[in-house]
């Protein structure tokens, strides 16, 4: 019985050119999380972190993807393009697969907020 | 050109110890993932696991967790499978073969030639 | 795990024909999906990796295609040497890395 939540900074907002952390939470389960993968919103991969081999950035966006903090994912150098649903998705033993949505807004405007809080999707 | 050459044939019995070596020729060693695959007679592929031949760092199948070992030795560019406490269903022919760069996991592309371990009392 | 399902298990076909193989994920392993052939008594070789890219040195009779959770090699010409078994894998959630069960193609 898959009994954990996925927690995530929900709808988020940052400006061109500046950098966003992308942050997802797991908890309520005492599942082990084997590995987390991070995907944008047409389901390409960004990133993995696997809990014994570390961090596996895809080559395609090593410029502009840091890991962290922690289990989230740092988004550099923002395009307009990268607005849009980001997923992260937790696999875990025993419990299966969690996943949580994010949606960035990427803004022309420099006084855009970098707004992120927690929240339940 | 890149290669990877396995040790002999071996016959065990129940109970025992398999001890299979990889040599890798041709490419940077400690540049690439390497896996161990299995192959029983008859039957499909399943994958043992991963060790980063740069820090040796591993992850096992959890089918495996207890019973292998990966270990590489740099000197020689040589990586080793240790599968204990064999039993007849281990009997098999294991494959080592390269993956992607460790930066990323990728599609195993040179494999090595296969090592025939019997199982049998 | 990710279950890797291939479909169908057995394929029969003539020389000079066309075959298609099908691989289905468990869920979406994005475009990090090979095709693996391996003919008796040899070490599988890879024909495809990232979906749709061909491994080197593989002929361009072999194609994939596919992303998330649908898979697909296409033989275009069957060549007498093309007469093996097929598996495709995953290599994006670990452990473990899966295979499916694998599709022999036999002459019809």
């Known amino acids: 019985m898959m009994t954990g939540t996925i927690e995530t900074t929900g709808n988020i907002s940052a400006k061109k050119g500046g950098s966003v952390i992308l942050q997802c939470h797991l908890s309520s389960t005492m599942a082990q999380v084997t590995q987390v993968n991070w995907e944008q919103h047409d389901h390409s991969l960004l990133a993995i972190r696997n809990a014994e081999l570390g961090w596996h950035i895809y080559p395609a966006f090593k410029d502009r993807v840091a890991p962290g903090p922690g289990l989230g994912l740092t988004l550099q150098s923002l395009t307009m393009n990268d607005t849009g649903e980001y997923f992260c998705t937790y696999h875990t033993y025993p419990d299966g697969t969690y996943r949580g949505r994010i949606f960035l807004e990427v803004l022309e405007s420099s006084v855009a907020e970098h707004s992120a809080r927690f929240q339940i999707p | 050109q890149v290669q990877l050459v396995q040790s002999g044939a071996e016959v065990k019995k129940p109970g025992a110890s398999v001890k299979v070596s990889c040599k890798a020729s041709g490419y940077t060693f400690r540049e690439y993932y390497m896996h161990w695959v299995r192959q029983a007679p008859g039957q499909g592929l399943e994958w043992m696991g991963i060790?980063?031949?740069?820090?040796?760092?591993?992850s096992y199948a959890r089918k495996f967790q207890g019973r292998v070992t990966m270990t590489r030795d740099t000197s020689t560019s040589t990586v080793y499978m240790e599968l204990s406490s064999l039993r007849s269903e281990d009997t098999a022919v294991y494959y080592c073969a390269r993956g992607g760069r460790t930066t990323w996991i990728g599609a195993f592309d040179i494999w090595g030639q296969g090592t025939m371990v019997t199982v049998s009392s | 795990e990710i279950v890797m399902t291939q479909s169908p298990a057995t394929l029969s076909v003539s020389p000079g024909e066309r075959a298609t193989l099908s691989c289905r994920a468990s869920q979406s392993v994005s475009s990090n999906l090979a095709w693996y052939q391996q003919k008796p008594g040899q070490a599988p070789r890879l024909l495809i990796y990232?979906?749709?890219t061909r491994a080197t040195g593989i002929p361009a009779r072999f194609s994939g295609s596919g992303s998330g959770t649908e898979f697909t090699l296409t033989i275009s010409s069957l060549q007498s040497e093309d007469f093996a078994v097929y598996y495709c894998q995953q290599y994006v959630v670990w452990p473990p890395l899966t295979f499916g069960g694998g599709t022999k193609v036999e002459i019809k």
């Open positions: 060790i980063n031949p740069s820090i040796g760092l591993t």
């Open positions: 990232g979906a749709s």
